[in-house]
């Protein structure tokens, strides 16, 4: 299937303007500068006829403005001014924004918990699975299997750092080297960003809301799959990440620190514990083979134990293993020898919810995964209802340039990396680049942040958290000192050699294009989200790792075809954009594919149909289960009773379509559709109005 | 108290076969292994072997394999060393032994002894 | 099979003396040795058991001491009681082993 969907009648230079052009698609310059225009997005819209595309009538009358639906939107003040009101008024309005900024700040506190709660939830359903990934003995040999194994235990855990302890544990107690132990921390890096993607998914109900927050979440993954992209391979050929840290951690005599100031837990762990708890020693000791953990309970029942070492004597099956020579003896029959152990006994039990209920993990893990959803989804539908009433008009304008807007000149590129550092500072002082990237998300959405802003932000957040790592490893104890420090630092390497790959230079901000992309081809067809996320966190690694235990043979053997199908799909199309006359004609565009291969067109309307059925019996549920209907089906009228997504479709048909503006060079005359562009009045209708 | 009681003196034939029982009372019978020792005129102790009663698991002396048989009759609480192929220098007392210090071979009670004479 | 080597075959002493038996076992057997006693026409008794743990009973004039391969039964003030046979035992390894023993007699 050719990358780029809509390919339907593409001219020569196809790749402008398609919904999914990984390319920052060119604009008409920005005429609202000189109207003193606040919102492009405002801006009318010529309508014109669609013109055959040798014509030059479109380029002479051109629209005034092009909608970009990157463009910030500008949220009105339709409230009365500070100065027009009286006194009462005045202190009304006072307690009212002291009102919203507690309840802003209240669902921001269940937002994190709700993110809390979901990664237990995740450790329940599939933290023995993840557990079991890594007692596979492949993982030394292959280091593609390696990274698939990291991302998929981060996605089953929804936590890095649980995978990332797992593997310093396994490396401490030589299950594993350093070499090995690289491409699953690669991987853990990917599967740490589906949380943030998943956040962005809750924001599906607003076309252009869910473009920016999708786009923005999915950044940070194409980030780390480019990354891994170029880096693994460079790993694996040089072991640079390897040789760098050995150098650094032999260099230094580290004494053992504390451990990192948990900041944002002191104030979140005295709810969650109430919820549940979870014993996450039991996912460390399946992934390192103890039979005996597999049939124990993540769910914690008992908090306060007394553990008491003895020494005991047990029978052994010969003298050979017995501990030493000199405490090995026998009654006559069998052979003993003396073990310290160490006798645990429940004191008292843990104070949640779950604790008398003696629920299989799968059962507490699925109830707290649709809770932990309804709640994260509640809380973000709410949060980007009050800071869209609070970041209206002359607020918003200050937010927004403070934010978004560059140092003066000759110091605008120091910018960017000021954001990393404050991203960088923000998630070591919440202790998760989860929880930083997630709550970054529907403000990318509502607007406050642009994406070109929300990117190094993003890569600052990568830092913070292996700076945790690090300071963690700090804290270990002598045995698991050395390699959960080196392997920290290869965590840290791997993110500053990210960084140089994908930020100093604008022209290799490639993330921000594909993210774009995506992003518009998500905008247009919600279902595609899902697709990306299922195919990219779940199907990839999941075929690579069946394929690397079926043998390297098989892998190379299905995975080299596959590889240089890419690469021509990619060639073809770089051609195609840059120098078509170069390709015979029929390969200047992709007219010679069948339409499913070319365009979401078709597969929407499989979708569609599949979804059919689900159209009416989710009509009258409460407003929060309208996004998750519109994500899934992407259907008009399955929300009937907000009339949101009626209203939406109405608006949409109603509308013409523009022609792009004449600077870009070509005359390919191509729907608003297809350049992933939406009406403005999409951008206002709400669809969880509560 | 703990008494092993042991059958009396036998005269035996080279080849033949020695059974000589070993009756325990005053503890839990299947609870501790219970071993055999012999001494022969003026020598010192050789272990033979032990079974426990419990399960019957036996561990026989490399010496005696493929001689010595130890059984026991858990209704009866007797305990059976049976010794077969018979030669002179099997002449010796025959001490039953019950070991109640758990878990190790010391042996801290003893039957009287039955003293097996092997001649022609 | 450890073979333990017991000294000396045996002595003769004033009641009231201190006597000390040594055993020596031909490998490492940690603590895993007992000490019997035998007197003439008698079963066994046991003394120590674990090297240094007296049985129940016996009189805290025996003493034992020793680890690994040597190993020492001391009866601290020899008593007309105390003339007998001394075994000592390893039960480290199967099969169980006994010293020679050391008679011990009054002059």
């Known amino acids: 299937m050719a990358p780029w969907p809509e390919l339907g009648d593409a001219q020569p230079n196809p790749d402008k303007y398609l919904e999914g052009a990984a390319g920052q698609q060119p604009t008409a310059p920005d005429k609202s500068k000189e109207t003193n225009k606040t919102d492009n997005t405002e801006a009318p819209v010529t309508k014109i006829e669609l013109l055959p595309s040798y014509s030059t009538a479109t380029l002479i009358d051109e629209p005034t403005e092009v909608d970009d639906p990157w463009n910030l939107p500008t949220l009105q003040d339709s409230g009365i001014k500070w100065s027009e009101r009286d006194t009462k008024g005045k202190i009304l309005c006072f307690f009212q924004g002291i009102g919203r900024l507690i309840l802003l700040l209240g669902f921001l506190y269940f937002f994190v918990c709700s993110l809390d709660i979901l990664s237990s939830a995740f450790q329940l359903v599939g933290g023995k699975m993840a557990g079991q990934f890594f007692s596979n003995s492949s993982i030394m040999s292959n280091p593609l299997l390696g990274l698939v194994i990291g991302v998929l235990v981060t996605v089953l855990v929804q936590s890095s750092s649980t995978s990332t302890s797992i593997v310093v544990s396994m490396v401490s107690s030589s299950l594993l080297t350093v070499r090995a132990a690289i491409p699953i921390i690669m991987g853990a890096n990917i599967g740490t960003s589906i949380t943030n993607t998943i956040v962005a998914l809750m924001q599906v109900g607003d076309r252009s809301e869910f473009r920016r927050a999708f786009a923005g979440a999915t950044v940070h993954d194409f980030f780390n799959w480019l990354s891994v992209l170029v880096l693994l391979p460079v790993e694996v050929a040089t072991h640079y990440l390897e040789i760098i840290t050995q150098l650094i951690v032999e260099s230094f005599h580290f004494k053992n620190g504390e451990d990192a100031p948990d900041l944002l837990k002191v104030i979140t762990k005295p709810f969650t514990k109430l919820i549940v708890q979870l014993d996450k020693k039991v996912i460390s000791q399946i992934a390192m083979n103890d039979e005996k953990a597999k049939n124990k309970s993540l769910v914690k029942i008992w908090c306060k134990t007394f553990t008491n070492k003895t020494q005991i004597n047990v029978t052994v099956p010969s003298t050979a293993n017995c501990t030493s020579p000199s405490l090995c003896w026998t009654d006559g029959i069998q052979n003993w020898t003396m073990k310290n152990v160490t006798y645990k006994e429940n004191i008292a039990k843990c104070q949640h919810i779950f604790v008398n209920f003696h629920l299989p993990d799968l059962a507490v893990g699925t109830i707290l995964l649709i809770l932990s959803l309804l709640v994260l989804c509640g809380c973000l539908i709410m949060i980007v209802k009050i800071l869209g009433s609070v970041l209206k008009g002359q607020v918003a304008t200050v937010i927004k340039k403070t934010i978004n807007t560059d140092f003066p000149f000759p110091f605008a590129w120091l910018t960017g990396y000021l954001a990393i550092l404050v991203g960088a500072g923000m998630t070591f002082i919440v202790q998760s680049s989860s929880v930083f990237t997630s709550a970054l998300t529907p403000l990318i959405g509502i607007g406050v942040i642009t994406i070109e802003r929300a990117y190094p932000l993003t890569l600052g957040s990568n830092i913070g958290t292996t700076t945790t790592a690090i300071l963690a490893a700090l804290a270990s104890p002598g045995n698991a000192l050395r390699s959960s420090l080196q392997i920290a630092l290869c965590h840290f390497f791997f993110n500053i050699s990210g960084i140089l790959l994908w930020y100093p230079i604008p022209f290799t901000r490639l993330p921000i294009r594909m993210a774009k992309g995506l992003g518009n081809i998500s905008a247009k067809y919600r279902w595609f989200a899902v697709f990306y996320l299922i195919i990219f966190f779940f199907l990839i690694p999941l075929t690579v790792f069946g394929l690397s235990l079926a043998g390297w043979r098989v892998l190379v053997g299905v995975g080299v075809p596959v590889v240089f199908i890419i690469i021509l799909v990619l060639c073809l199309r770089l051609l195609q954009s840059r120098c078509p006359r170069v390709l015979p004609k029929k390969l200047q565009n992709w007219n010679f594919l069948p339409l499913w291969m070319r365009s979401l067109k078709p597969w929407d309307a499989v979708v569609s149909k599949f979804t059919g059925c689900f159209q009416m019996r989710c009509c009258c549920c409460c407003r929060v289960c309208c996004r998750a209907c519109c994500l899934l089906c992407d259907c008009p009228k399955c929300c009937r009773c907000s009339k949101c997504c009626e209203d939406l479709e109405e608006a949409q048909e109603g509308q013409d379509v523009p022609v792009k503006a004449p600077e870009t060079f070509d005359n390919i005359t191509i729907s608003r559709e297809a350049q992933g562009e939406v009406p403005a009045s999409d951008s206002k209708t709400e669809c969880t109005a509560l | 108290q703990v008494q092993l009681v042991q059958s009396g003196a036998e005269v035996k034939k080279p080849g033949a076969s020695v059974k000589v029982s070993c009756k325990a009372s005053?503890?839990?019978?299947?609870?501790?292994?219970m071993h055999w020792v012999r001494q022969a005129p003026g020598q010192g102790l050789e272990w033979m072997g032990a079974?426990?009663?419990?399960?019957?698991?036996?561990s026989y002396n490399q010496k005696f394999k493929g001689r010595v048989t130890m059984t026991r009759d858990t209704s009866t609480s007797t305990v059976y060393m049976e010794l077969s192929s018979l030669r002179s220098e099997d002449t010796a007392v025959y001490y039953c032994a019950s070991s109640t210090i758990i878990t190790t071979g010391a042996v801290d009670y003893w039957g009287q002894g039955t003293l097996v004479t092997v001649s022609s | 099979d450890i073979v333990m080597t017991q000294s000396p075959s045996s002595l003769s002493t004033s009641v009231g003396d201190r006597v000390t038996i040594t055993c020596k076992a031909s490998?490492?057997?940690?603590?895993?040795v007992a000490w019997y006693q035998q007197k003439p026409g008698q079963s066994p008794k046991l003394l120590i058991y674990w090297t240094s743990t007296r049985h129940t009973g016996v009189p805290d004039r025996f003493t034992g001491s020793g680890s690994g391969t040597d190993f020492t039964l001391i009866i601290r003030s020899l008593q007309p009681e105390d003339v007998a046979t001394y075994f000592c035992q390893q039960y480290s390894r199967i099969p169980l082993t006994f010293g020679s023993g050391t008679k011990v007699e009054i002059k």
């Open positions: 490998q490492d057997v940690g603590t895993a």
């Open positions: 005053g503890y839990t019978f299947i609870t501790y292994n």
């Open positions: 079974i426990y009663p419990g399960s019957g698991d036996t």
